[in-house]
């Protein structure tokens, strides 16, 4: 069976996000992957989208992330743009209205995105074979 075009877009966006660090990719997010054994795929995507939404809602105008130079400001705006695109596509793939995120574990945004990229690539390899 064919891979969803949304999945390809998600992987492309994750590649863009994980290639370069910004001032705020070292900030922490809820690590939904730490204990996700009894979670369905759709729930995982939904919860990942929720985590990303929480992050960009909280940090979009964070002065620490916006930085002191126009260059840093530009990079943060690009980061937020990609996170919003990723959020939107994950919701589309999840097909759920809402999902709880209660984990206490934290990971950096950078590590969170790398883990999500691994999961998405595994999903892509299954659906493309």
């Amino acid at each position: 069976h064919k891979c969803d075009i949304t999945l390809q877009e998600i992987i492309k966006t994750l590649n863009s996000l994980t290639e370069q660090k910004t001032l705020c990719t070292e900030l922490t997010v809820t690590d939904i992957f730490a204990a996700s054994k009894n979670t369905t795929e759709k729930e995982t995507f939904c919860r990942a989208a929720t985590v990303l939404r929480q992050f960009y809602s909280h940090h979009e105008k964070d002065t620490r992330c916006l930085g002191a130079t126009a260059q840093q400001f530009h990079r943060h705006k690009q980061l937020i743009r990609f996170l919003k695109r990723l959020d939107r596509n994950l919701w589309g793939l999840a097909g759920l209205n809402s999902c709880p995120v209660k984990e206490a574990n934290q990971s950096t945004l950078e590590n969170f995105l790398e883990r999500l990229k691994t999961i998405m690539r595994e999903k892509y390899s299954k659906c493309s074979s």
Partner: antibody, heavy 123, light 106 residues
């Protein structure tokens, strides 16, 4: 494809203001994913970044030139400009304009450059 | 300001030789490091971006490596058309170019 072209006087007198314009063709200067920069190269020497201007109109300047540099953009003409005040012979150089940034990356190098224009500071 | 120290400043090699240029940053710049080629009378051309990525259309004999403060640019088999000056450039915090390396044929 996108092209950049510098224009302006090739000779400027000491203490006056050097003014150059970069015209962008084959694409819009208004994309929020890209930014625009000026780089110079004195004869027989290396490259020196002068400054950059972003979609929002915000700018970054080389700290060593900051007090003398102004970069502005005119979206209606698809142009951006450089003004360098109080010039001396040390400002004699080839001046390049360039595009940075990317739509599919957080940031990218200056990947498209103009051909450069030689500016001589002399009385 | 971040300083970029490039070496050697010039080198002479034979066609087919492996050529290596190094660039050292005065502080950690992650992978925000580019390599440009400039031929006499021409504008610089981007060859490698983010330390190791080959720009579209650039021959595969050009490569880059490194992260943090130490970076290397390699031409695996020098060709006559590679005669040029090569510059590294950091864009981690604003922009700084290395001093350049002039590559000549023996």
């Amino acid at each position: 494809q996108l092209q950049l072209q510098e224009s302006g006087p090739g000779l400027v007198k000491p203490s006056e203001t050097l003014s150059l314009t970069c015209t962008v063709s084959g694409g819009s200067i208004s994309s929020e994913s890209y930014y625009w920069g000026w780089i110079r190269q004195p004869p027989g020497k290396g490259l020196e970044w002068i400054g950059s201007i972003y979609y929002s109109g915000s700018t970054d300047y080389n700290p060593s030139l900051k007090s003398r540099v102004t970069i502005s953009v005119d979206t209606s003409k698809n142009q951006f400009s450089l003004k360098l005040s109080s010039v001396t012979a040390a400002d004699t150089a080839v001046y390049y304009c360039a595009r940075g940034g990317a739509s599919d990356r957080i940031d990218h190098a200056f990947d498209i450059w103009g051909q450069g224009t030689m500016v001589t500071v002399s009385s | 300001d971040i300083q970029m120290t490039q070496s050697p400043s010039s080198l002479s090699a034979s066609v087919g030789d492996r050529v290596t240029i190094t660039c050292q940053a005065s502080q950690d710049i992650s992978n925000y490091l580019n390599w440009y080629q400039q031929k006499p009378g021409k504008a610089p051309k981007l060859l490698i971006y983010d330390a190791s990525n080959l720009e579209t259309g650039v021959p595969s004999r050009f490569s880059g490596s490194g992260s943090g403060t130490d970076f290397t640019f390699t031409i695996s088999s020098l060709q006559p058309e590679d005669i040029a000056t090569y510059y590294c450039q950091q864009y981690y915090d604003l922009y700084t170019f290395g001093g350049g390396t002039k590559v000549e044929i023996k």
